[in-house]
């Protein structure tokens, strides 16, 4: 299993759990059901993963290939500025918002979108693969 921070970069990834997709050096889980943002976060944490934290535009573009018009929760929140769940600021992409109550972040094939946090959406978890060491 991965050692250290959930948010660290993984080295070469031998395998991912069932129903998880391997992409690059990480495993991704695209949910079938829908939950609110907090429940989605808890789902990921319970599986030694975290709600998707996107590191750069390249990763975002690659993941969007697997997305539709439907929005998915990701590990992004607006708390005096948009920040990822690892504490880093959102600085490589813009997020669309139409209201002050939309403080949780979602993604679809068109980009990032703010949403009110209680609405049920699909979600994406991200984790290191099995038998791997985290790079710091």
């Amino acid at each position: 299993l991965c050692q250290g921070s959930n948010y660290s970069t993984c080295a070469s990834c031998p395998s991912c759990p069932d129903r998880w997709m391997k992409y690059g050096n990480h495993c991704y889980y695209f949910s079938v059901e829908e939950k609110d943002w907090n429940s989605s976060l808890e789902f990921c944490l319970a599986r030694d993963s975290h709600l998707l934290v996107i590191t750069d535009n390249q990763e975002m573009s690659l993941l969007q290939v697997f997305l539709s018009e439907a929005f998915c929760w990701i590990g992004l929140r607006n708390n005096s500025g948009w920040r990822w769940e690892d504490g880093s600021p959102l600085n490589f992409s813009r997020i669309s918002s139409n209201s002050f109550v939309q403080t949780c972040g979602a993604i679809n094939k068109n980009g990032l979108q703010a949403s009110s946090c209680e609405v049920p959406l699909h979600w994406v978890c991200k984790k290191c693969p099995f038998a791997d060491q985290a790079l710091f």
């Epitope: 139409n98 209201s99 109550v101 939309q102 403080t103 946090c117 209680e118």
Partner: antibody
Amino acid sequence: EVQLVESGGGLVKPGGSLKLSCAASGFTFSNYYMSWVRQTPAKRLEWVATISGGGGYTFYPDSLKGRFTISRDNAKNTLYLQMSSLRSEDTAMYYCARDQDYGTIYYAMDYWGQGTSVTVSS
Amino acid sequence: DIQMTQSPSSLSASLGERVSLTCRASQDIGSSLNWLQQEPDGTIKRLIYATSSLDSGVPKRFSGSRSGSDYSLTISSLESEDFVDYYCLQYAGSPPTFGSGTKLELK
């Protein structure tokens, strides 16, 4: 028919407390965000607070944080505003309003109550 | 805070006249703007939401539009019940803020 009926207003001394209620009917209350807005004697409208449908998320202007608390009882279809440490500048007509939330789309304050008057004076 | 500068503060007009009220936003608010109507008894009603969408039951003589940071409410032909107060509301930024109001008076 959507109806919002505020109550609980009145005359209160500076430093005192008051709890306003807003009884909602004609729609599925728990599906909607709700807000409180006040109108000063000078006719200026000011946002006071907003709460999510499930009650898990609340929003306030910095100037009122800590003194005012918005809450709701979805079983009773009622919205509340607890006001404490009241000041003369809190004197206003207080309105509750319904907000339409569709997650990634949000439309503010589509229906308003008739208001309840709060006067803070010694 | 986002400032909403509403003009004019009062407007005298005649029945059947076309009038426009404007709100200027100090920051980008996209289309997150409502127009509200307030009767003399205090009753508040939303007329326009999301800049240009007409609420159900609102007469078609009311319309909303945007040009850059300027948002307008236009009444194409004034009727007697239109001579009341109007406010804009932006809800994109926190806190939501209102214009200072326009009093529409019969000339």
